[in-house]
């Protein structure tokens, strides 16, 4: 297993609709064709997997049907969006990138993006 640098923003504020987006960029040492991206949440010293997707370079990210994440890729950048967030979901969201194929296997873990979520009052006759 070889190490790889992963960069992500330090702080993101979720929208009033509970949507947060951030870019996860990795320094690919080679020409990977298959990449796996995992979003981990760290809060109260507990780490849980939020979502994960494997994609072939040049193709769309494919998350599970019931995933709360969506994303797109462009070169060595992955644009991740998490939806349905509320105040209790505030925490550090860590981007983990694995270059699965071809060998050698590379692993990179970002420092995390602190996502802040506020529960707003709904506006009259609207969805926030």
């Amino acid at each position: 297993c070889k190490a790889m640098h992963v960069a992500q923003p330090a702080v993101v504020l979720a929208s009033s609709r509970g949507i947060a987006s951030f870019v996860c960029e990795y320094a690919s040492p080679g020409k990977a064709t298959e990449v796996r991206v995992t979003v981990l949440r760290q809060a109260d010293s507990q780490v849980t997997e939020v979502c994960a997707a494997t994609y072939m370079m040049g193709n769309e990210l494919t998350f599970l049907d019931d995933s709360i994440c969506t994303g797109t890729s462009s070169g060595n950048q992955v644009n991740l969006t998490i939806q349905g967030l509320r105040a209790m979901d505030t925490g550090l969201y860590i981007c983990k990138v694995e270059l699965m194929y071809p060998p050698p296997y590379y692993l990179g873990i970002g420092n995390g993006t602190q996502i802040y979520v506020i529960d707003p009052e709904p506006c009259p006759d609207s969805d926030f």
């Epitope: 939806q83 967030l85 509320r86 209790m88 979901d89 529960d119 926030f128």
Partner: antibody, heavy 123, light 107 residues
Framework: QVQLVQSGAEVKKPGASVKVSCKAS????????IHWVRQAPGQGLEWMGI????????ISAQKFQGRVTMTSDTSTSTVSMELSSLRSDDTAVYYC????????????????WGQGTLVTVSS | DIQLTQSPSSLSASVGDRVTITCRVS??????LNWYRQKPGEIPKLLIY???SLQSGVPSRFSGSGSGTDFTLTISSLQPEDIATYYC?????????FGQGTKLEIK
């Protein structure tokens, strides 16, 4: 095991207030939102509001704003819902239900409900 | 206001039938939708969450699909105990509105 136990049935007069409580056990009370839902006799489900027990922040449906007050007591793992200025059409069964943060992916929203509290408003 | 419209409002089907109930939402809610079954005199029971995830302990004859604004609950083979009213609910954000319900009866 996870339980939400609600207070007993109430009979109130129009214009009065009612307070329904929901005591949680079997899970970390401050890690889940609690919703209030009501159901009038023979009618559908109606969402009333949500409370974050850890901070006490609330959101209520527009229809109930100004009339509903939701509170939490972390020392007893209890949330309460008070509805004021009662009318006959507030006669309903009132339910509480828990709801995890969405990133708690192993738990489903509204997976556990209280047994319901019948509130009858009659002169 | 955000509207959830279920169709049909009532339906009658035979044991073993495939039954489909639809829920249309007035705004895009991605996949954040629940389905419930409520038998007479009982509390609502969660069947499906996030549009297609089967809640633990729920029979596999129940399935959900859809995203955005159009969702479907399917019972692959109707059983006598499925006599109930079915509700959809958006869990995207407040208000966590319910559909008006679909009353299912056995022929």
């Amino acid at each position: 095991q996870v339980q939400l136990v609600q207070s007993g049935a109430e009979v109130k007069k129009p214009g009065a207030s009612v307070k329904v409580s929901c005591k949680a056990s079997g899970f970390t009370f401050t890690s889940y939102y609690i919703h209030w839902v009501r159901q009038a006799p023979g009618q559908g489900l109606e969402w009333m509001g949500i409370i974050n027990p850890s901070g006490g922040s609330t959101i209520s449906a527009q229809k109930f704003q100004g009339r509903v007050t939701m509170t939490s007591d972390t020392s007893t793992s209890t949330v309460s819902m008070e509805l004021s200025s009662l009318r006959s059409d507030d006669t309903a069964v009132y339910y509480c239900a828990r709801d995890p943060p969405i990133t708690m992916v192993r738990d489903a929203p509204f997976d556990y409900w209280g047994q319901g509290t019948l509130v009858t408003v009659s002169s | 206001d955000i509207q959830l419209t279920q169709s049909p409002s009532s339906l009658s089907a035979s044991v073993g039938d495939r039954v489909t109930i639809t829920c249309r939402v007035s705004q895009d809610i991605s996949r954040l939708l629940n389905w419930y079954r409520q038998k007479p005199g009982e509390i609502p029971k969660l069947l499906i969450y996030r549009a297609s995830s089967l809640q633990s302990g729920v029979p596999s004859r129940f399935s959900g699909s859809g995203s955005g604004t159009d969702f479907t609950l399917t019972i692959s083979s109707l059983q006598p105990e499925d006599i109930a009213t079915y509700y959809c609910q958006r869990t995207y954000s407040a208000p966590y509105t319910f559909g008006q319900g679909t009353k299912l009866e056995i022929k």
